[in-house]
Structures are given as C-alpha cells and as structure tokens.
Amino acid sequence: LVPHLGDREKRDSVCPQGKYIHPQNNSICCTKCHKGTYLYNDCPGPGQDTDCRECESGSFTASENHLRHCLSCSKCRKEMGQVEISSCTVDRDTVCGCRKNQYRHYWSENLFQCFNCSLCLNGTVHLSCQEKQNTVCTCHAGFFLRENECVSCSNCKKSLECTKLCLPQIENVKGTEDSGTT
C-alpha cells in the first residue's frame, strides 16, 4: 500500500532531498532553508539561492524547512510547576521539565504537570521515582496505599477500597464477623 501523501509532500517528493518545488513553477527545485531560518522568498530560478532569513527572537525552526514564518517558542507552564531546562534558540524550542524529586503527569500529549515524588513514609520504596512515574511504595503493616501515600488503617472505614488491605485491623476492631472477602 502506498501511504497517502498531502499536496505539500507530493510536491516535495518531486525534488531531491533538501529541496522543494517552487510553488509557482513546478520545473524549479529550490534549496530548503536551514534550521534557525525561514523562507523569505523562493529561489528565482534553477541553481539560484533561496532567500532565507534568521528567525527573530522568540521564534525558531528546528529542521530544514520552507516555512513562511518561524514557530513561536513554547512557554513553560509555571502554574503546573514546570521549570525551564533550556531556553529557546533560533533552532531549538524551549525545553521544560520538573524540579528535582518531582515527576511529570501528562494531562495530554504535550501538557504535563509536576508532582512531588512520594517519600514512602510508613512504607518502603519498591520502585524509585522516575521522570514520568511516581515512586512505587509498599506500605508497612497497619497502613494502606492511597494515591501512593501510606495511610494508617485507622482511617479506613468499612466498605471502602482499603477494607481488604486493612482486613486484620478491621476485624480486630469490628469483631470476627465474616466480611465476605477472602
């Protein structure tokens, strides 16, 4: 099966790599602009230079292109705890991340929020905190895991999801009646 190509990809595939077809004259292949620049004017003819201009401050292009405008630099989302790892340059977008001992939770493909890694108080670290994953804790006896924090079984009411985890403690408090769990 031949993958479906958009108009732009069809036009580009006619020219050798690193060149694109002139939008007004399909017999001319113009050289693409280097990363960090954008297309100001198409080449006037075969073998003649494309007019490329450097991106202005606050914009970038990360690969060779024939874009009429540079892309706007991303801004790190401070309200989501993001910090700037590296600033935007003409050929690279801003890189955002989280502080030390934090992990990323992605709300969508490109939008993440920074959360503090769990310390596993009243438990032990089963898996260390990673860039996109919180610490995995194993709780000590008498504690249950709630949103990756170890919480005392004294906070566990019957019929809640902690019941099975705190079953011995609940039986001690409530007596030895059969709770219907195994």
Partner: nanobody
Amino acid sequence: EVQLLESGGGFVQPGGSLRLSCAASGFTFEWYWMSWVRQAPGKGLEWVSAISGSGGSTYYADSVKGRFTISRDNSKNTLYLQMNSLRAEDASVYYCAKVKLGGGPNFGYRGQGTLVTVSS
C-alpha cells in the same frame, strides 16, 4: 466497582452556558484527583480540566481557560463543570474521569458521557 455518571449536557447557542455534573460511587471520592475530558465526533479524547481531591488545585486546557470552571462537592461525591461563553468547537461528548497520577494521559475510569451541542 467505580461508577461515574455524567449529566447536564444539551443543546445551547454560541455564547450560552451549561453546568455538567458527575455523580461518583464505588470509591472514596475525596481521595482522588478528578478530570473532565471530551471527545468531538471523529476525534480523540481531549483533556479539559482537572481538580485535586480537596478541590484546592484546579487546572485547565488553554482552549477553555477563563470560560470553564471545575469544582467538586465531596460531601455529595459530585464533580461539576461550569461552561460559559460556549463556542461551536466546544461541542463534544464530555466525560468525567478518575485520575491515576503518573505517566498519562490516562483516563481509564470514566463515565458514559453527556453530549454538549453548540449551534445557532
């Protein structure tokens, strides 16, 4: 068993308002972050907003910021989404979702959705 039941959707003209509700059961509601996501016909799930267990922290997608407000009533196990200044592009099926923090985007536990239609 986790159950989430959305309501409040309907037909509204551009510029109008709607308030969505989500009744939660089968888990300790106040312990968990909750989220609203939406899906327009033929498109993927889009995150809209999220709120912490206590309700103290709220977050919004750029596309709805300043127009939508997420809130919760933990005594009623209910999540809300107040939608103002609705636009044609807001038309979608809206789902509430129980959030599992870390990694993502993950909206494994979500309801059956409520349809919002915005048209003149």
